[in-house]
Interface confidence: low
Amino acid sequence: ARNGDHCPLGPGRCCRLHTVRASLEDLGWADWVLSPREVQVTMCIGACPSQFRAANMHAQIKTSLHRLKPDTVPAPCCVPASYNPMVLIQKTDTGVSLQTYDDLLAKDCHCI
Amino acid sequence: ARNGDHCPLGPGRCCRLHTVRASLEDLGWADWVLSPREVQVTMCIGACPSQFRAANMHAQIKTSLHRLKPDTVPAPCCVPASYNPMVLIQKTDTGVSLQTYDDLLAKDCHCI
């Protein structure tokens, strides 16, 4: 079994990158974004069992304390480790503008 | 109340810094750490309701999609925004050493 990267809960259950297709309406952006009309939102979804993709020492501590005190300390959480930029064409008072967002789409994931 | 920082679930329910007292045995460190014998572990615990302490655009998107597809997209999660360093006195083959860990204690929290 892989140290730190084998999912003990069964295939596909642990923290990894997923894509969710969303319209501007879904995102609440229809009033200020022109394009794209639909976004492939990459996000981190899945469980973080013991030491799976632990981001750092804090995540390791959290796992240990969650095992001891599950009602007090939550398990680590699956969150982005880094992001991919995305360009939105936005509505402005004078027309349109291109804006790059660096923190919109998850690139890869870890547990923290 | 500050926009994005008012907890609609009631005082203390939302994402914030907590301290959990843990022994070296609790942490599984007894075989390699000499001191401190007990650690005041600061960690981020609490709910992340709509737009509460949203770390970035990704967190805002996650909130929107969680509202639409709660079975598919999880709510944002309360995680450290930054860390405080901590010095551990470790056992070595020849005696002891001081080691600073930069990613051990949460300093402040946000939702992502």
Epitope: H6, P11, G12, L17, H18, T19, T42 | -
Partner: antibody, heavy 117, light 107 residues
Framework: QVQLQESGPGLVKPSETLSLTCTVS?????????WIWIRQPPGKGLEYIGY???????YYNPSLASRTTISRDTSKNQFSLKLSSVTAADTAVYYC??????????WGQGTLVTVSS | DIQMTQSPSSLSASVGDRVTITCRAS??????LNWYQQKPGKAVKLLIH???TLHSGVPSRFSGSGSGTDYTLTISSLQPEDFATYFC?????????FGQGTKLEIK
């Protein structure tokens, strides 16, 4: 024994929609794995098209996303690929596969789709 | 996308030879590297996943190693059934991407 079998027309006209189905036996597609489409143009490397996951999540390679739809029919234990507005560049052997733990452990034999008028 | 560069693109060898195929990623892929075998008209077979873990039923003459960006597939003693095309694939960052393949032929 897990088996996957691709089916669909071998010839599609330019600008039309390519439609393929993958029939899975020996394992329920309603379980945890990712169900994937991959293609290989003649004489070229493999290209990942995308997946469908049991929870209803899909992923499409950004280079093909605007033309791609992957869906599931759990009652028939099948998943499907639709690729719209095809051109000659979409001529390839199309494979379906299963990804259970960051690797594709079972593949279909592949089906050649030619785009030509 | 992560680019996977595989070498050599073709290789002639004899039964009993030791063969090594390499794969280089354009960025660190954290050991999420898989190796596959492809034969004409047959389904692709997974040989090795996560750099070095042999898939069930794969002979022990196949082995994998590497870390970071550089990975290797080794066949310790070639058998007649091993002549095929081999390709690597990274599973660290979507979209998963593949090497161009190495065609292993009989000398």
């Amino acid at each position: 024994q897990v088996q996957l079998q691709e089916s669909g027309p071998g010839l599609v006209k330019p600008s039309e929609t390519l439609s393929l189905t993958c029939t899975v036996s020996g394992f329920s597609i309603n379980r945890d794995c990712y169900w994937i489409w991959i293609r290989q143009p003649p004489g070229k490397g493999l290209e990942y098209i995308g997946y469908t996951f049991y929870s209803g999540i899909t992923y499409y390679n950004p280079s093909l996303a605007s033309r791609t739809t992957i869906s599931r029919d759990t009652s028939k234990n099948q998943f499907s690929l639709k690729l719209s507005s095809v051109t000659a560049a979409d001529t390839a052997v199309y494979y379906c596969a299963r990804d259970c733990d960051y690797a594709m452990d079972y593949w279909g034999q592949g089906t050649l789709v030619t785009v030509s008028s | 996308d992560i680019q996977m560069t595989q070498s050599p693109s073709s290789l002639s060898a004899s039964v009993g030879d030791r063969v090594t195929i390499t794969c280089r990623a354009s960025q660190d892929i954290s050991n999420y590297l898989n190796w596959y075998q492809q034969k004409p008209g047959k389904a692709v077979k997974l040989l090795i996943h996560y750099t070095s873990t042999l898939h069930s039923g794969v002979p022990s003459r196949f082995s994998g190693s590497g870390s970071g960006t550089d990975y290797t597939l080794t066949i310790s003693s070639l058998q007649p059934e091993d002549f095929a095309t081999y390709f690597c694939q990274q599973g660290n960052t979507l979209p998963w991407t593949f090497g161009q393949g190495t065609k292993l032929e009989i000398k």
